[in-house]
Amino acid sequence: MGSAALEILGLVLCLVGWGGLILACGLPMWQVTAFLDHNIVTAQTTWKGLWMSCVVQSTGHMQCKVYDSVLALSTEVQAARALTVSAVLLAFVALFVTLAGAQCTTCVAPGPAKARVALTGGVLYLFCGLLALVPLCWFANIVVREFYDPMTPVNARYEFGQALYIGWAATALLMVGGCLLCCGAWVCTGRPDLSFPVKYSAPRRPTATGDYDKKNYV
């Protein structure tokens, strides 16, 4: 039962992580303006994401607009888009691989091959987490570097947006879930007795005398 529990828990974590990654990818809050200058005539918050940016005026009026062109974006936003979308799509592929290798499905015949498929699913989820972690940390690095750069104007300094935190949580879930799936597959190959509880009744072996146990006779 152990490996099945690991498998189910791992898959649940990966699915939640995948959802979080999609959310982080779509949210326009990767960077949020930091309020450091109290002399600004009209306070407004600017949110920047991978696909659009939003401006929230002091009145509460919010306006969001999709970027005019991919070309108008900085290289890191273009790279972050590519890596995050790749991670989301790879997680989708990983889901089918994991389901094919799951002990509760019959896509692949039980045995070492099925365990290898399950292991591949886990590794793919692990890789998804790492792939998504790159743009998140890259963005965070830029935000920190520009925040402390004396050349950056006060009204152009940004802080981490909620999307970064959601993204980090999602990558953690993907990596932990991926590890659990790998462990489940590993346990399954090494200890078949801990796998999904499908009971097969093995034939009784004859006793040393060559006779069957008397209890077997009615």
Partner: antibody
Framework: QVQLKQSGPGLVQPSQSLSITCTVS????????VHWVRQSPGKGLEWLGV???????DYNGAFKSRLSISKDNSKSQVFFKMNSLQADDTAIYYC????????????WGTGTSVTVSS | DIVMTQSHKFMSTSVGDRVSITCKAS??????VAWYQQKPGQSPTLLIY???TRHTGVPDRFTGSGSGTDYTLTISSVQAEDLALYYC?????????FGAGTKLELR
Amino acid sequence: QVQLKQSGPGLVQPSQSLSITCTVSGFSLIRYGVHWVRQSPGKGLEWLGVKWSGGSTDYNGAFKSRLSISKDNSKSQVFFKMNSLQADDTAIYYCARGLDGYYVPDVWGTGTSVTVSS
Amino acid sequence: DIVMTQSHKFMSTSVGDRVSITCKASQDVSTNVAWYQQKPGQSPTLLIYWASTRHTGVPDRFTGSGSGTDYTLTISSVQAEDLALYYCQQHYSTPLTFGAGTKLELR
């Protein structure tokens, strides 16, 4: 403080080329694009082209054949070159930083007044 | 190319007045409009983008509105320092195009 300082000749001979250097400070050319716009009494404001942060360039079709925009990220400089100038190219030439992600010049340079005359 | 038309070359006003400067696009630019202010001998400065979003540090007496092909820049209470040239610009597609400008002057 975001600044764009321009340097270039004030007078250009007809059929000669114009070269302007835009030196930026307060932001990085790796993160922001730089637009070029000119202003003349007869034609008003005309957008000439833009050098994007990623290195690609967009030109106004009307000037594409005689316009070249390049940059040096390490020196924070953008170079503008226009060939075959005529009298009607007399204008003030501006470089301007692009609003991140949009076709909007948000901070404009000091401007270079160019007269095409022999 | 998209043509931006500012119907008034000049607009007369008094300090404290409410004034509206209009701009018409030759096609739908779906709120991709910016407004600039230019004072004599100076470079243009961005006031409004996305038709209604004020640029950082722009006083809230400046408001932008409009959709489709018709856009307006409104100054709720004109100050002496607001007397300048105002240009609209579309950022819907390249080449970017500007209006001919409207000069705001004292009555």
